[in-house]
């Protein structure tokens, strides 16, 4: 059955109740330098209206402190008013090392990430840090990567593995789940000239992914106790027609295509999931498709196999899928793929339809073909117009945070948490944010803030308290943190 | 060595065709665009278009659509560009060069430059 | 078509001093945190080289004299400090959307 009635149950302490934010830009200096700058000045008010420095006078400064970056006062305000837990958002590679390489580290823009990990740990609210987060504008890559082939080129792997590094070198006693790429099976929308391209792109992330992964593992680890993994877009498919064959075959089709394409290298066998590697061949063999999965190596199997530390999955709705043979040697031909618009379903203004089932059928679906794996939801939301009652956004958090409670309490499915995307709106863009783009809130706030403070959907007479030790342990392993390195 | 290797000068009557080549080595020529230049003596650079040799897709500037053809033979690693209705005013040098379609799409590699003089 | 405007038309350099090159666009060639404009050099009866790329990167084996900056639509080229062999044609190109098109060239002269 599609939907369920809604169950009454809560999550367990230790969910994480989180917000996801895209790529902050760091700001290049502190905005508050009134309190750095040791002269006296007296203004002339009357005359020239300007200031003019009074000298032999030094008076006391005080530390330069990370709220005097604006940006970083703005977004623990917005934080403080979600009452989340986690706070998951991603650094800028291309600000932290302008050349690509180790050569050029920008050390302003690592203080300023610090600052907002070290502010938020004040409040209660632990990072979960993204290392790189392209999106379907913007590539994200240093310059001089973008002009050597970007992830075409199998060094691009190498130079991400050395600024992960560096990350978990200055954040990772701060930071203790890490995101390395960010939907990386979405960069064939970017990389979509032919299969072989996208296909291309999608070895060299995935090489990179376990480098960076290995590092950590190996050097990082054993003082830093994280866990690091990578975000996949996991879409749920269903089969348009529910009463023909050949649309089933499709929705599972596009679970390979989409999830399987990078979780099974990752999760499993350090190879292409077989089915999808089958389906291009067959294409190839017929003289539908030039596209070919690249042949991995043994050492290349070794390296992918077993890179994760749990399943993180960005969903936002569910596809009607039907099967349609395409021409053409690019990713989205090589699939076979028609996707259906449901006008009967309730969809926001960019078409993302609301099937709140859908999440429920994908985490059953990870655990049957992955194992009984944490599984934390990294961003899952919908754009809505509203600027104030955005009731969709409520409505969609409600009907899908109890689909994820269904598959917790009667799946047994281990989800650690959810992260709402997204915390603040850009301008121009489809309307995603709690917070309007000139940080208005909106009133889904509270709808969440409820959820969260009642740890889900209890029964009346249930408690939303948790042991108190349990409460406390992550704010005093903040302030010890805060108080070692500030 | 990346460089392109184009063909040598060629001398042609007014109203006929050329076809002149670009032979690329020491990269997978598949993967990047063959961008075609003009320049006249002593003035400036106009692009002409690009061809992708991937799939032989093609991209004009609207002044070059009627006038260059552009092709490229994957077994030889070698675009073609030809020009027709050749005038007096096409007595110019034409360049190739590669650019990253995906990346900067500036143009790293440069052939030598090919001489066409059109002349009765 | 985005129009490029370089300035000036020539100039005239002694050895060991700055050299400043212009390059205005008609409208923003800046997209996606990327700057899409690029320097090229070029010697008679050779092809033109490029020297920087994305507006502000240097182009491997190009000597660190050569530098670039700029966002949007105003661009400039500097050379410091400038030594003979840097006689030559520069041109800016842009590469922000179809046509290509590149600026008219500024001719360097070393006294």
């Known amino acids: 059955k599609e939907s369920t009635p809604d169950v009454q149950g809560q999550f367990p302490c230790d969910f994480s109740w989180g917000v996801t934010e895209s790529v902050l830009k760091p700001e290049s200096v502190a905005s508050s330098p009134q309190f750095s700058d040791p002269h006296l000045y007296v203004w002339n008010a009357t005359g020239n209206r300007l200031l003019h420095r009074v000298e032999g006078v030094r008076l006391k400064t005080r530390p330069a402190q990370c709220t005097d970056f604006v940006n970083i006062k703005k977004q623990l305000e917005m934080l403080a008013r979600m009452k989340v837990t986690h706070y998951r958002f991603a650094l800028d590679w291309a600000s932290v090392l302008p050349t690509g390489n180790l050569s050029a580290v920008n050390r302003q823009a690592l203080r300023y990430y610090r600052c907002v990990v070290s502010e938020g740990l004040k409040l209660g609210i632990s990072a979960m840090v993204t290392l790189y987060y392209p999106t379907h504008a913007h590539l994200g890559l240093p310059e001089p990567l973008l002009h050597a082939d970007g992830w075409l080129n199998p060094s691009t792997a190498e130079a991400f593995q050395a600024y992960a590094g560096l990350c978990f070198q200055e954040l990772g006693d701060l930071v203790k789940l890490w995101i390395t790429i960010n939907e990386p099976n979405r960069l064939s929308d970017i990389y979509n000239r032919s299969g072989n391209d996208t296909y291309g792109a999608a070895h060299n992330l995935l090489v990179a992914h376990a480098l960076a992964w290995r590092l950590y593992d190996r050097q990082f680890r054993p003082s830093q106790r994280g866990a690091v993994s990578l975000s996949l877009h996991a879409d749920w498919a269903e089969p348009a027609n529910p009463y023909a064959d050949s649309h089933w075959r499709a929705a599972e089709r596009f679970l390979q295509f989409e999830i399987a394409w990078f979780a099974e290298p990752l999760f499993k066998t350090g190879d292409y999931p077989a089915a999808m590697r089958e389906y291009i061949a067959s294409k190839h063999r017929r003289g539908l498709s030039s596209s070919a999965l690249p042949r991995l190596t043994e050492a290349e199997r070794r390296l992918l196999k077993g890179t994760v530390d749990f399943c993180a999955l960005n969903h936002f709705t569910t596809r009607f899928v039907m099967h349609e043979q395409l021409a053409g040697s690019r990713y989205d031909s090589d699939r076979d793929i028609q996707f259906l618009q449901d006008i009967t379903r309730l969809s926001s203004p960019t078409r993302l339809a609301v099937i709140p089932w859908g999440v429920r059928k994908l985490l059953r679906w990870v655990r049957r073909n992955y194992g009984d794996m944490d599984i934390y939801i990294t961003a899952s939301g919908i754009d809505d117009q509203a600027l104030e009652d955005d009731r969709l956004r409520k409505y969609y958090l409600g009907k899908y945070l109890q689909e994820v409670l269904k598959a917790y309490l009667i799946d047994k499915v281990r989800i650690k948490g959810y992260y709402a995307f997204k915390l603040a709106e850009e301008k121009s863009k489809p309307r995603f944010g709690f917070f309007t783009s000139d940080f208005k809130a909106k009133s889904s706030i509270q709808f969440y803030n409820k959820v969260i403070s009642s740890r889900g959907f209890p029964f009346e007479n249930s408690s939303s308290r948790c042991s108190q030790t349990q409460e406390n342990t992550e704010c005093t392993v903040c302030l010890f943190l805060v108080q070692k390195k500030p | 060595q990346v460089q392109p290797q184009e063909s040598g000068p060629e001398l042609v009557k007014p109203g006929a065709l050329v076809k002149i080549s670009c032979k690329a080595s020491?990269?997978?020529?598949?993967?990047?665009?063959i961008n075609w230049m003009k320049q006249r003596p002593g003035q400036g650079l106009e692009w002409i278009g690009w061809?992708?040799?991937?799939?032989?897709?093609?991209k004009f500037n609207e002044n070059f659509k009627d006038k260059a053809t552009l092709t490229a033979d994957k077994s030889s690693s070698t675009a073609y560009m030809q020009l027709s209705s050749l005038t007096s005013e096409n007595s110019t040098v034409y360049f190739c060069?590669?650019?990253?379609?995906?990346?900067?799409?500036?143009?790293?590699?440069w052939g030598q430059g090919t001489l066409v003089t059109v002349s009765a | 078509d985005i129009v490029l405007t370089q300035s000036p038309a020539s100039l005239a350099v002694s050895l060991g001093q700055r050299a400043t090159i212009s390059c205005r666009a008609s409208?923003?060639?800046?997209?996606?945190?990327?700057?899409?404009m690029h320097w090229y050099q070029q010697k008679p009866g050779q092809p033109p080289k490029l020297l920087i790329y994305?507006?502000?990167n240097l182009e491997s084996g190009v000597p660190a004299r050569f530098s670039g900056s700029g966002s949007g639509t105003d661009f400039t080229l500097n050379i410091h400090p400038v030594e003979e062999e840097d006689a030559a044609t520069y041109y800016c190109?842009?590469?922000?959307?179809?046509?290509?098109?590149f600026g008219g060239g500024t001719k360097l002269e070393i006294k």
């Open positions: 409208k923003s060639v800046s997209t996606s945190g990327y700057s899409y």
């Open positions: 020491g990269y997978t020529f598949t993967r990047y665009d």
């Open positions: 060069a590669r650019s990253d379609y995906y990346g900067s799409r500036s143009f790293t590699y």
């Open positions: 994305l507006a502000s």
């Open positions: 190109q842009h590469s922000r959307e179809l046509p290509y098109t």
């Open positions: 061809i992708y040799p991937g799939d032989s897709s093609t």
